[in-house]
């Protein structure tokens, strides 16, 4: 007996072929011998089966000896053995209909868990194998669980259900609600304008929620809320903002914040949270601000950085077009009695310059 796998809600064609390529009598029945459809003259006739209103056949193929039955909008309970009677012979086809659905909303926050549940006909023993957009493979039986979703899990999951050496493929679109980056660092010279951007890793037709940026300045003992805002249909409106610093926020997505000046007292790290309407939990993005200052005071040339820097970063003072350099894996470097000329202060990571500030040392007479 031939086995055909179908998907819930889908359409399936059960084939039945006669040896002679001509129009002949045929009919389809279910395992209870109830007629589903058949032929009477040139007319397609329907029987009393529950399937009849969803069953069809292609007249144009009858002349080719093909008397297939097409079943639309498949249901799990359509799983059955169907019998095609043609030319005094019976052809049996076993149809097994499966459904695979996400237990919750398919729009999930990063870190939340995803559960996929397989609906299957009684007596079947299918196996399921799912592949994430990032290439992660997960296997299971009636349920498949992904405990902690990551942003790279966003996209189309392809799940293959296997039964009796046959397979049927399901595609499920999962949207992981997250920012594009978990963390970002902005490097600025003192006095420069700072731009913070928080692009989302997803698009929704209607995006509504509220958010807040908490800031922990390196010099401060505790963190404080710099700004709170609302998001309504992708439009951003500021609710409350501190007086110092006076942040500005863009009215459209992506979320965009402007700090008028980078100052040492602002250097530190922040956490932007976004709570979306009808979703439990919040989206997070960490943002860091590193500020550089180069100063000359009497006979001392100093370069300092404030903010979260890794110990492997190098801070250097270098005289332009000269070999004179002082470098340290520290947050401050200085040169006593510096030569006259243009000095460069460089913050670098394995030779890659992250931030640079120039200061002119004039000769003292």
């Amino acid at each position: 007996k031939k086995v055909v796998l179908g998907k819930k809600g889908d359409t399936v064609e059960l084939t039945c072929n006669a040896s002679q390529k001509k129009n002949t009598q045929f009919h389809w029945k279910n395992s209870n011998q109830i007629k589903i459809l058949g032929i009477q003259g040139l007319f397609l006739t329907k029987g009393p089966s529950k399937l009849s209103d969803r069953a069809d056949s292609r007249k144009s193929l009858w002349d080719q000896g093909c008397f297939s039955m097409i079943i639309k909008n498949l249901k799990i309970e359509d799983s059955d053995t169907y019998i095609c009677e043609v030319e005094n012979k019976k052809e049996e086809v076993e149809l097994l209909v499966f459904g695979l659905t996400a237990n919750s909303d398919t729009h999930l926050l990063e870190g939340q868990s995803l559960t996929l549940t397989l609906e299957s006909p009684p007596g079947s023993s299918p196996s399921v194998k799912c592949r994430s957009p990032g290439g992660k493979n997960i296997q299971g039986g009636r349920t498949i669980s992904v405990p902690q979703l990551e942003r790279q899990d966003s996209g189309t999951w392809t799940c293959t259900v296997s039964q009796d050496q046959k397979t049927v493929e399901f595609k499920i679109d999962i949207v992981v609600l997250a920012f594009q980056k978990a963390s970002s660092t902005v490097y600025k010279k003192e006095g420069e304008q700072v731009e913070f951007s928080f692009p989302l890793a997803f698009t929704l037709e209607k995006l509504t929620g509220s958010g807040e940026l908490w800031w922990q300045a390196e010099r401060a003992s505790s963190s404080k809320s710099w700004i709170t805002f609302d998001l309504k249909n992708k439009e951003v409106s500021v609710k409350r903002v501190t007086q110092d610093p006076k942040l500005q926020m863009g009215k459209k997505l992506p979320l965009h914040l402007t700090l008028p000046q980078a100052l040492p007292q602002y250097a530190g790290s922040g956490n932007l949270t976004l709570a979306l309407e009808a979703k439990t939990g919040k989206l997070h993005q960490e943002v860091n601000l590193v500020v550089m200052r180069a100063t000359q005071f009497q006979e001392n040339l100093t370069c300092e950085v404030w903010g979260p820097t890794s110990p492997k970063l190098t801070l250097s003072l270098k005289l332009e077009n000269k070999g004179a350099t002082v470098s340290k894996q520290a947050k401050a470097v200085w040169v006593l009695n510096p030569e006259a000329g243009m000095w460069q202060c460089l913050l670098s990571d394995s030779g890659q310059v992250l931030l640079e500030s120039n200061i002119k040392v004039v000769p003292t007479w």
Partner: antibody
Framework: QVQLQQWGAGLLKPSETLSLTCAVY????????WSWIRQPPGKGLEWIGE???????NYNPSLKSRVTISVDTSENQFSLTLISVTAADTAVYYC?????????WGQGTLVTVSS | DIQMTQSPSSVSASVGDRVTITCRAS??????LAWYQQKPGKAPKLLIF???SLQSGVPSRFSGSGSGTDFTLTISSLQPDDFATYYC?????????FGQGTNLGIK
């Protein structure tokens, strides 16, 4: 709601090959048949051929020697290739779903064959 | 090939009129016939299938009848939205064929 979206080159020179692709969104791909129909400007409808998800085809005998319909089930797409086109092939080409009746239809692509 | 012949080729009518379009098949096609409506610049739309079954979403003023070789599409009370070209199509055998069309215009 099933939607058919089609695309392909709109301007060809005589003897060139016409290529159109149709993508099926939001519905079942298997179990149905997928057809191409054309309509010359100001004229009636002509069925070109059909394919199912397993690649079984039927063609209009009037075009059979020049036409190929292929299917890509992984992308829920099917394509039309018509070789050695002439001005008589100028038409709006539609992709359509069917079992026995044509519904729904793609938006149509005007293909003009001109030297 | 099965030839499908529609008549009339064009007809003018007024809003509220009852309009009948006929389609004749060159051989017996039982009830394997559909009717389509097409407006300028648009794809055809299925109205009636299996000779007399109304497609979901189509107004009930449209009806189809006939069997064998002679078929009729009737619009019981013409509405402004109904001015279009109408085609019949047979699904009895390959190649599928259409009537040449009936243009329904405003009187």
């Amino acid at each position: 709601q099933v939607q058919l979206q089609q695309w392909g080159a709109g301007l060809l020179k005589p003897s060139e090959t016409l290529s159109l692709t149709c993508a099926v969104y939001g519905g079942s791909f298997s179990g149905y048949y997928w057809s191409w129909i054309r309509q010359p400007p100001g004229k009636g409808l002509e069925w070109i051929g059909e394919i199912n998800h397993s690649g079984s085809t039927n063609y209009n005998p009037s075009l059979k020697s020049r036409v190929t319909i292929s299917v890509d089930t992984s992308e829920n797409q099917f394509s039309l290739t018509l070789i050695s086109v002439t001005a008589a092939d100028t038409a709006v080409y539609y992709c359509v779903r069917l079992i026995n009746w044509f519904d729904p239809w793609g938006q149509g692509t005007l293909v003009t064959v001109s030297s | 090939d099965i030839q499908m012949t529609q008549s009339p080729s064009s007809v003018s009518a007024s809003v509220g009129d009852r309009v009948t379009i006929t389609c004749r098949a060159s051989q017996d096609i039982s009830n394997w016939l559909a009717w389509y409506q097409q407006k300028p610049g648009k794809a055809p739309k299925l109205l009636i299938f299996a000779a007399s079954s109304l497609q979901s979403g189509v107004p009930s003023r449209f009806s189809g009848s006939g069997s064998g070789t002679d078929f009729t599409l009737t619009i019981s009370s013409l509405q402004p939205d109904d001015f279009a070209t109408y085609y019949c199509q047979q699904a009895n055998s390959f190649p599928y064929t259409f009537g040449q069309g009936t243009n329904l215009g405003i009187k």
